[in-house]
């Protein structure tokens, strides 16, 4: 799935926030060296998901999945020749 | 590398108005229940988070986008 390929750490953090799992969020944020104030801020966002219940989390997860798999992200507008792919892998 | 559309959605979630955020979501998923949920979450975040909190959340996002794991 394209989501996992593009920026796995983003989706780790997003789904940890949306799931309401504080331990998982802490683990994900450790991977990017988040400071204590940064962790506090992310936990405030997480609180909103927890307070609004399971359906809210599922619906927002649906939004993120829809955007991530939209043509804006999937490459309908993107060059995809072999030459370009070679260039793109060199760029990183 | 994060998709620009995802980056924008998250940025608006933190820095946009509720109307802006909901309209952005509507471009991808125009179901009333989804949009109502987006507004509820956005309003909650705006109520809970100070400007400093939002700056810190944006800082985390910046760390995510520039991480080797992204």
């Amino acid at each position: 799935v394209k989501m996992a390929e593009t920026c796995p750490i983003f989706y780790d953090v997003f789904f940890a926030v949306a799931n309401g799992n504080e331990l998982l969020l802490d683990l994900s944020l450790t991977k990017v060296n988040a400071t204590e104030p940064e962790r506090t801020a992310m936990k405030k966002i997480q609180d909103c998901y927890v307070e609004n219940g399971l359906i809210s989390r599922v619906l927002d997860g649906l939004v993120m999945t829809t955007i991530s798999s939209s043509k804006d992200c999937m490459g309908e507008a993107v060059q995809n020749t072999v030459e370009d792919l070679k260039l793109n892998t060199l760029g990183r | 590398e994060i998709c620009p559309a995802v980056k924008r959605d998250v940025d608006l979630f933190l820095t946009g108005t509720p109307d802006e955020y909901v309209e952005q979501v509507a471009q991808y998923k125009a179901l009333p229940v989804v949009l109502e949920n987006a507004r509820i979450l956005k309003n909650c975040v705006d109520a809970k988070m100070t400007e400093e909190d939002k700056e810190n959340a944006l800082s985390v996002l910046d760390k995510i986008y520039t991480s080797p794991l992204c």
């Epitope: 804006d72 507008a77 | 590398e1 620009p4 802006e20 952005q24």
Partner: antibody
Amino acid sequence: EVQLVESGGGLVRPGGSLRLSCAASGFTFTSYAMNWVRQAPGKGLEWVSSISSYSSYIYIADSVKGRFTLSRDNAKNSLYLQMHSLRPEDTAVYFCAREGYSAYSYFDFWGRGTLVTVSS
Amino acid sequence: DIQMTQSPSTLSASVGDRVTITCRASQSVISWLAWYQQKPGKAPKLLIHRASSLESGVPSRFSGSGSGTEFTLTISGLQPDDFATYYCQQYNTYFPTFGQGTKVEVK
């Protein structure tokens, strides 16, 4: 100081090819998506193409899709536009522009442009 | 594609005048709109982004407003240096589009 310097423009026959380059300096190149915008003589601005920081997302205008290829070399702080099957309507000043946001955005810095003339 | 329509195409004004340029989008662009100034033979210069945010270094006589489909650029007291062509640009989609331009000329 942010600087964008385009090169590679010139006179080319219809059906011909040309490669434009944009040398960037004064900022962290990998932090920004980059674009080409063109302006035909006496006309308005037309967006041509955009490339994200690490080339994962490359967007091309329908008017040039299949003929123009966009790439960047982050090690050289350079942006490239390879143009094939050129038409008279591609005649324009081509500007290299830096995006001010993420990968679809406004353009906060522009180069001076390079003129491409397609004529027989 | 989202079409951007500017009005008027040409505007005759004098130094000190209050000038307003309108930009309409064929569909909502939320607040993803920028304004540029361009002088002959030069590259465009960013004035305003996100409909109303003034770019750093741009004089405060320039202001932007609007959201959705209708936007305006206002120059509160026209200066000699402001005679130029102005363009709006939407960036709500990954393929941005520009208005056709408004030329502000000396009356």
